[in-house]
């Protein structure tokens, strides 16, 4: 009786770890303001919290600058990025700016880097006005793989919101590849 | 041997409680807007649907224009909110508007409340166009405690579009808290 | 003692199937560009992209433009759509422009349609600048029947930008109905 | 100090026009909304016009509309209102106002402004 009870256990056992959602990775990282490259042109970002206010990581690596998967599974990804400038800061290069975000997977095994999402717009950005706003939003559902490794690239980082309610972006896990 | 059942059956009622995802907390709330305030400065809006339409809640609460967290977890949380202008409804004192939105979290123990997202952009509405529309989405992962409760300031709430499909915002738990 | 093991075993892998998060519908469809209509008005976009790229389908069907929910469940919906226009694509009819999205919910046993999410924006896209960008990102938890069709509508089709990470769309299930 | 100087009122017939200026000073012009009021003999004072901080956007009390035009030069830092077909019922002290937008249509209440210039008297005769 006992050994079926074990057998019986142990597939419980082992449905339990499989389902426990507790398990399940995320990651919830926020910009790194101290740190933030200038210029116009597209860069990737690599400084970012992990465990400071809102950001957190479970099941996942932040490792240079990138988010690493460790746990092969369908995930959601989502970013959040925002610009913003005042007069004060002195006045802009040009009024019209292209303000993206490019979220990329690249994988080490075969050493490429892809587009997942993109998003943002072109403003116009007048000296007629103090202070100018712009956020971004992008999210979808992907397969990742362990050691896949994601990051954000964007253009005029220097015009990036520093707050952690502004400049973020994660991921959590949805349920196993079949 | 019964015993031995019972004891197992026991635990896997336990496991099917605890992972049974029906028991998962949502919500996704939508404007009411027979009671949104007047002003161009930040407010909070505290007057939403949670049961008709596309309106819904499970296992959390809604009071006082707050969304209540009532189990601890991560949940995913997002909002959508559209701002309209049609020439009819009147003229706009600057064109120079700042369309924004934050998700904040209140906690009753520690009274403080904390942006959790922001998003928006300022937009140039001139006279010249008949009709001005513009939607901002934000999204992310956060853990939320029993008790806490969620938010949304806009500013410029007069110029909201007060339809469903719209103006709303959501939640839903992903996981437990380890 | 076996019919007792049959019995809990029995329970156990319905609760397995049940739970088994690898049985959870989603879908993620990137936009087909060579057959995108032309016009400025709000049109159905019924060519998307399920088995290629980040483009992907389980649980779900995909069948004349339109996602087709196989299974009960609440769902968490999302969509980004990216538009785009160069100069050396020839001359805007207009400079202000309506660049929106809706997602749509159709039920077949009563043939009715409605709109669950919309976002967008009015633009001024002058001859000024060479290029212009602007994107969309809408998301939101619905509760969706077998036999339910999402479908997206745009205005200014022609417009879109064709990459598989600026225009998608997609869905997970996320639980069960009660 | 701010102040707004109102100037352009005088006697007129009925039926003429007439072009009222309000030079503004010590705040960012550009950033305010402006208005113009008006006080008749023995009554309250009441909206006559207001124009946004760009100028894209004006309202009007519906007695003075298709008649009076209000518009701003940022660059001048003024607000004009052109007065044209003058009515008998026209004669007032009419004052320039300023505030920053803190709704988002254009306000239409004296309370609703900060800022007030002395006024100038128009006199329409019959």
């Known amino acids: 009786i006992r050994a079926e009870k074990a057998m019986v256990d142990g597939s419980w056992l082992d449905l339990a770890k499989r389902s426990k959602l507790e398990a399940q990775p995320f990651a919830h990282l926020t910009i790194n303001a101290t740190d933030i490259p200038s210029g116009s042109h597209k860069v990737s970002l690599s400084s970012w919290y992990h465990d400071r206010g809102w950001a957190k990581i479970s099941n996942m690596t932040f490792s240079n600058g990138k988010l690493i998967v460790n746990q092969d599974g369908f995930y959601y990804l989502y970013a959040n990025i925002c610009f913003r400038h005042h007069e004060t800061s002195g006045d802009l290069a040009t009024e019209y700016l292209q303000l993206m975000v490019y979220v990329t997977k690249t994988s080490i095994k075969i050493p490429s880097s892809h587009t997942l999402m993109k998003g943002g717009s072109t403003k116009y950005w007048s000296g007629n006005s103090e202070f100018h706003f712009y956020s971004i939003n992008v999210g979808g559902f992907f397969k990742l793989r362990s050691g896949e490794e994601i990051s954000i690239e964007v253009s005029n980082p220097s015009l990036l919101d520093p707050d952690q309610d502004a400049t973020y972006f994660g991921a959590f896990k949805v349920r196993d590849i079949d | 041997i019964r015993a031995e059942k019972a004891m197992v059956d026991g635990s896997w009622l336990d496991l099917a409680k605890r992972s049974k995802l029906e028991a998962q907390p949502f919500a996704h709330l939508t404007i009411n807007a027979t009671d949104i305030p007047s002003g161009s400065h930040k407010v909070s809006l505290s007057s939403w649907y949670h049961d008709r339409g596309w309106a819904k809640i499970s296992n959390m609460t809604f009071s006082n224009g707050k969304l209540i967290v009532n189990q601890d977890g991560f949940y995913y949380l997002y909002a959508n909110i559209c701002f309209r202008h049609h020439e009819t409804s009147g003229d706009l004192a600057t064109e120079y508007l700042q369309l924004m939105v934050y998700v904040t979290k209140t906690s009753i123990k520690i009274p403080s409340s904390h942006t959790l997202m922001k998003g928006g952009s300022t937009k140039y509405w001139s006279g010249n166009s008949e009709f001005h529309f513009y939607s901002i989405n934000v999204g992310g992962f956060f853990k939320l405690r029993s008790g806490e409760e969620i938010s949304i300031e806009v500013s410029n709430p007069s110029l909201l579009d007060p339809d469903q499909d719209a103006t709303y915002f959501g939640a839903f738990k992903v996981r437990d808290i380890d | 003692i076996r019919a007792e093991k049959a019995m809990v075993d029995g329970s156990w892998l319905d609760l397995a199937k049940r739970s088994k998060l690898e049985a959870q519908p989603f879908a993620h469809l990137t936009i087909n560009a060579t057959d995108i209509p032309s016009g400025s008005h709000k049109v159905s976009l019924s060519s998307w992209y399920h088995d290629r790229g980040w483009a992907k389908i389980s649980n779900m069907t995909f069948s004349n433009g339109k996602l087709i929910v196989n299974q009960d469940g609440f769902y968490y919906l999302y969509a980004n759509i990216c538009f785009r226009h160069h100069e050396t694509s020839g001359d805007l009819a207009t400079e202000y422009l309506q660049l929106m999205v809706y997602v749509t919910k159709t039920s077949i046993k009563i043939p009715s349609s409605h709109t669950l999410m919309k976002g967008g924006s009015t633009k001024y896209w002058s001859g000024n600048s060479e290029f212009h960008f602007y994107s969309i990102n809408v998301g939101g938890f619905f509760k969706l029947r077998s036999g339910e069709e999402i479908s997206i509508e745009v205005s200014n089709p022609s417009l879109l930008d064709p990459d598989q990470d600026a225009t998608y769309f997609g869905a997970f299930k996320v639980r069960d109905i009660d | 100090e701010v102040q707004l100087v109102e100037s352009g009122g005088g006697l007129v017939q009925a039926g003429d026009s007439l072009r009222l200026s309000c030079a503004a000073a010590?705040?960012?012009?550009?950033?305010?909304?402006m208005g113009w009021f008006r006080q008749a003999p023995g009554k309250e004072r009441e909206f006559v016009a207001a124009?946004?901080?760009?100028?894209?956007?004006?309202g009007y009390v519906d007695s003075v509309k298709d008649r009076f035009t209000i518009s701003r030069d940022n660059t001048k830092n003024t607000v004009y209102l052109q007065m044209a077909s003058l009515k008998p019922e026209d004669t007032a002290v009419y004052n320039c106002?300023?505030?920053?937008?803190?709704?988002?249509?254009?306000?239409?209440?004296?309370?609703?402004?900060?800022?007030w210039g002395q006024g100038t008297q128009v006199t329409v005769s019959s």
């Open positions: 106002a300023a505030t920053t937008p803190t709704t988002s249509y254009l306000p239409r209440s004296e309370r609703q402004y900060e800022y």
């Open positions: 010590g705040f960012t012009f550009r950033r305010y909304v």
């Open positions: 124009i946004s901080t760009g100028g894209t956007w004006t």
